[in-house]
Structures are given as structure tokens and as C-alpha cells.
């Protein structure tokens, strides 16, 4: 969280980021609000990169003005229109691409004064992993997949039973470029698995975090997975 | 639950002056714009102004510069409206709104008015 | 200031019609205009906001649209708890009301 004020006195106003990360070839939100206005005439919102000589979007008199806006996001921002009057200067970004990290500068002003907030935006790719049984094997094994990471994760794996061990040894990771040839997906295989016990498949980069989970009794086979973007970074 | 509770209904006499008051809760009172509109017997929606409670900050419209005076007090989460000189045509249904976002989301159940000599 | 103009003070209109209310404001607001029911005795409440909107638990049936200087209200089923004044309302400039439709059930 980063928190902005303009400059002293009357005339100033606070702007609040959030530092946040955006998964290639989809759409980002880069997260910033602002002390309320009455009069959405009042309010100008200008995004700015830092080694970005165009604006990455503007927004005044109750509309977007994108005359400066520099060709790497033309056609690829809009703000929340209806929610600007609310204080919500938050930008969405389409099709993020790698080339789009970098440090933001959300820029207000209304009639109550001006402030501004950086955010840091990072971007890279990231999915939710899933652990099958993988019948084809000779021993029992699991099989932990998933889609598009980038940059490349470390991949660890855990078990209930087991707490603290090392499955390094009895596992193998892999990592196969995607047809884009930026992202990979990811591999890795458990091997020696015993039954009634939880496994996790735990992919790490330094944006995103990811667990697959996989419960295997005789009875039946139970999974969960979820993901965290590790952008919470306070400052 | 977001709902501001405006003061009960005032009787004054032409010239005098009246104070209503509008206590928020169940938001940060500090953040939202609180609005002020009145309302004549039969007639339509005015506003009148807003205050921003966090700095202070008012607005009024042209009509009710000198007329009305928005203040708001932090500690009570409370805001208020002082209607000077009144005259028979103050007379009204006085709303307090909170611009929680886009437009008046939560009104006042009103504070009615009466001017009489 | 800038004027709203509801051109009908009053619309009568039976269960299950449809319905709309304009207003029409003197300058371009692009989308800054909010929609309010009042109920006789009560006090006004949000249903549609910039424009199009509908606010948060607002029945489906209610709807707005429009941009600049002209916008409608819709009520696409009347229901006889609609009878009510509708004031449509611009927050592009210092906040006006426009003056009101009075929907009449038959």
C-alpha cells in the first residue's frame, strides 16, 4: 500500500496504491483511489511509466482524453467510468505483456487539490496447479501440472504425514516452453507415494504462489488448489 | 448499517435561526461527501450544498450562499446544517445524504421545517 | 447552473405496462446522471446511478439509459409499488434535480 499526498496545506489531496502484478496476454488492474469529488467535472486522472514518455492514460470532464497517450497502450486501458465520482482511479490494462512492468504514477486532481501514489507493477505468468494420480506409472506417482508460469518457479512438494521431509530426491521437475516462447508449463512428478496421506505441489516465482493439493485414501481421491499473488507488499 | 439520522422537526419564527443536525453511521464519516437538500411541501428536490467532513472542505449552491452553513464535527460523526433568517419560504423537508459513491446513496429520513410567525 | 427538464410532471400507466421518463439536461454531462424514487412520505432512494447503472438491489425491471443530454428511465413492468415521483439528477456540475415525474397507476 502506498499512500500519496499533494502538496502542503489546503491544497492537497490523498492518493492510495496498491502494488499489484499482472498475468501475461490477460488483463491487469492497476489499483489507485483518491479522496472523493462532488463534481465529476472536478476530476482528472493521468496514469504515467516511468521511462514512458506518453501518458498511459487520461481521464477528464467526465471522459477519457487520449491524445498523449503513447502507442504501447493504445487501445489498452480504460478506467472504471462510472465509479471515478466514488474516488476509484483504478486503470484496467488489456493483454498485459511482459514489457509492462515498471513503476506507475496515478495523478489526481479536483477541486479540492492534487496528489499522486507510485506503484509498483510487476508481470509474469501464473496458473493453478493440478496433482493427478498417474495411473501409467510402475509405482504409485503423482503428476502436478500447470499451464503458464513465468519467470520460471521453483517447485517443492509436501506431505502431511511427513512434515519437514525432503521429497527432492524421489521427484522430477520439468519445464516445457509454450508455443509463445515466454511462458512454460510445469511438470513434476512424486514418486513412491503411500496411500492415506495429503500431498502438496507447492510452485513458487517471485510474483505468484500456488498449491495443489491431493488427499489419496483407497476410497477415494480428494483435491483442492489455490494461488496467491505476492504483491502485498506494504510501504 | 449506513443510515444517517437527522434531528426531529423544528418550529421558528420568521428571522430566527435553526440548526439541524445529521449523525452518520456504520462508515467512516470522515471520506464521503455529506449532501443537503431541500424539499417544499408538493415540490421537487434542491440542492443546497456539501461538506466534506475529513478537512472540512464546502460547497454550496448560489441560492443558499448566506443562507445556510455546513459544518461537521468528527467526534460525533455528526453533521449539521444552520439555516439563518428564516422567512416563510425556508419552510421544508430538509434531507442530509451521504455521497457514499456515484450519486445520494443513503438519505436521511428528513427533518421538516416550519417558519410561522 | 445546469437545468434537468422532465418534460412530464405526471404519467399514468397501468400493472405490467412500460414505461419511460426522460430528462433532458441544458449541457453535455456524459454519463453523470442519477435516477431516484420518493414513495409519498418517505425520503428519495438511489435506483440507477451514471446513467446506466442499476444500484445495488434495485429489481432488474428498473433501467436507464443514455449519455451527454438526453437520458430515459425504463420501468420495463409497472408494479403497483412503483407509484412514486422520479427525479432524475446530474453530478457532472454543482448536483440539480429535474422536477419530477409523478407515475399514476390507472
Known amino acids: 500500500l502506498i499512500i500519496g499526498f499533494g502538496i502542503s496545506g489546503r491544497h492537497s489531496i490523498t492518493v492510495t496504491t496498491v502494488a499489484s502484478a499482472g498475468n501475461i496476454g490477460e488483463d491487469g488492474i492497476l489499483s489507485c483511489t483518491f479522496e472523493p469529488d462532488i463534481k465529476l467535472s472536478d476530476i482528472v486522472i493521468q496514469w504515467l511509466k516511468e521511462g514512458v514518455l506518453g501518458l498511459v492514460h487520461e481521464f477528464k470532464e467526465g471522459k477519457d482524453e487520449l491524445s498523449e497517450q503513447d502507442e504501447m497502450f493504445r487501445g489498452r486501458t480504460a478506467v472504471f467510468a462510472d465509479q471515478v465520482i466514488v474516488g476509484n482511479a483504478s486503470l484496467r490494462l488489456k493483454n498485459v505483456q511482459l514489457t509492462d512492468a515498471g513503476t506507475y504514477k496515478c495523478y489526481i486532481i479536483t477541486s479540492k487539490g492534487k496528489g499522486n501514489a507510485n506503484l509498483e507493477y510487476k508481470t509474469g505468468a501464473f496458473s493453478m496447479p493440478e496433482v493427478n494420480v498417474d495411473y501409467n506409472a510402475s509405482s504409485e506417482t503423482l503428476r502436478c501440472e500447470a499451464p503458464r508460469w513465468f519467470p520460471q518457479p521453483t517447485v517443492v512438494w509436501a506431505s502431511q504425514v511427513d512434515q519437514g521431509a525432503n521429497f527432492s530426491e524421489v521427484s522430477n521437475t520439468s519445464f516445457e516452453l509454450n508455443s509463445e516462447n515466454v511462458t512454460m508449463k510445469v511438470v513434476s512428478v512424486l514418486y513412491n507415494v503411500t496411500i492415506n496421506n495429503t500431498y502438496s505441489c507447492m510452485i513458487e516465482n517471485d510474483i505468484a504462489k500456488a498449491t495443489g493439493d491431493i488427499k489419496v485414501t483407497e476410497s477415494e481421491i480428494k483435491r483442492r488448489s489455490h494461488l496467491q499473488l505476492l504483491n502485498s507488499k506494504a510501504s | 448499517q449506513v443510515q444517517p439520522q437527522q434531528s426531529g422537526a423544528e418550529l421558528a419564527r420568521p428571522g430566527a435561526s435553526v440548526k439541524l443536525s445529521c449523525k452518520a453511521s456504520?462508515?467512516?464519516?470522515?471520506?464521503?461527501?455529506m449532501q443537503w437538500v431541500k424539499q417544499r411541501p408538493g415540490q421537487g428536490l434542491e440542492w443546497i450544498g456539501a461538506?466534506?467532513?475529513?478537512?472540512?472542505?464546502?460547497r454550496y449552491t448560489q441560492k443558499f450562499k448566506g443562507k445556510a452553513t455546513l459544518t461537521a464535527d468528527k467526534s460525533s460523526s455528526t453533521a449539521y446544517m444552520q439555516l439563518s433568517s428564516l422567512a416563510s419560504e425556508d419552510s421544508a423537508v430538509y434531507y442530509c445524504?451521504?455521497?457514499?459513491?456515484?450519486?445520494?446513496?443513503?438519505w436521511g429520513q428528513g427533518t421538516s421545517v416550519t417558519v410561522s410567525s | 447552473d445546469i437545468v434537468l427538464t422532465q418534460s412530464h410532471k405526471i404519467m399514468s400507466t397501468s400493472v405490467g405496462d412500460r414505461v419511460s421518463i426522460t430528462c433532458k439536461a441544458s449541457?453535455?454531462?456524459?454519463?453523470?446522471v442519477a435516477w431516484y424514487q420518493q414513495k409519498p412520505g418517505q425520503s428519495p432512494k438511489l435506483l440507477i446511478k451514471?446513467?446506466?447503472y442499476r444500484y445495488t438491489g434495485v429489481p432488474d425491471r428498473f433501467s436507464g439509459s443514455g449519455s451527454g443530454t438526453d437520458f430515459t428511465f425504463t420501468i420495463s413492468s409497472v408494479q403497483a409499488e412503483d407509484l412514486a415521483v422520479y427525479y432524475c439528477?446530474?453530478?457532472?456540475?454543482?448536483?440539480?434535480f429535474g422536477g419530477g415525474t409523478k407515475l399514476e397507476i390507472k
Open positions: 451514471s446513467a446506466s
Open positions: 439528477q446530474q453530478h457532472y456540475s454543482n448536483p440539480t
Open positions: 449541457q453535455d454531462v456524459r454519463t453523470a
Open positions: 461538506i466534506y467532513p475529513g478537512d472540512g472542505d464546502t
Open positions: 445524504a451521504i455521497n457514499w459513491g456515484y450519486a445520494m446513496d443513503y
Open positions: 456504520g462508515y467512516t464519516f470522515t471520506t464521503y461527501w
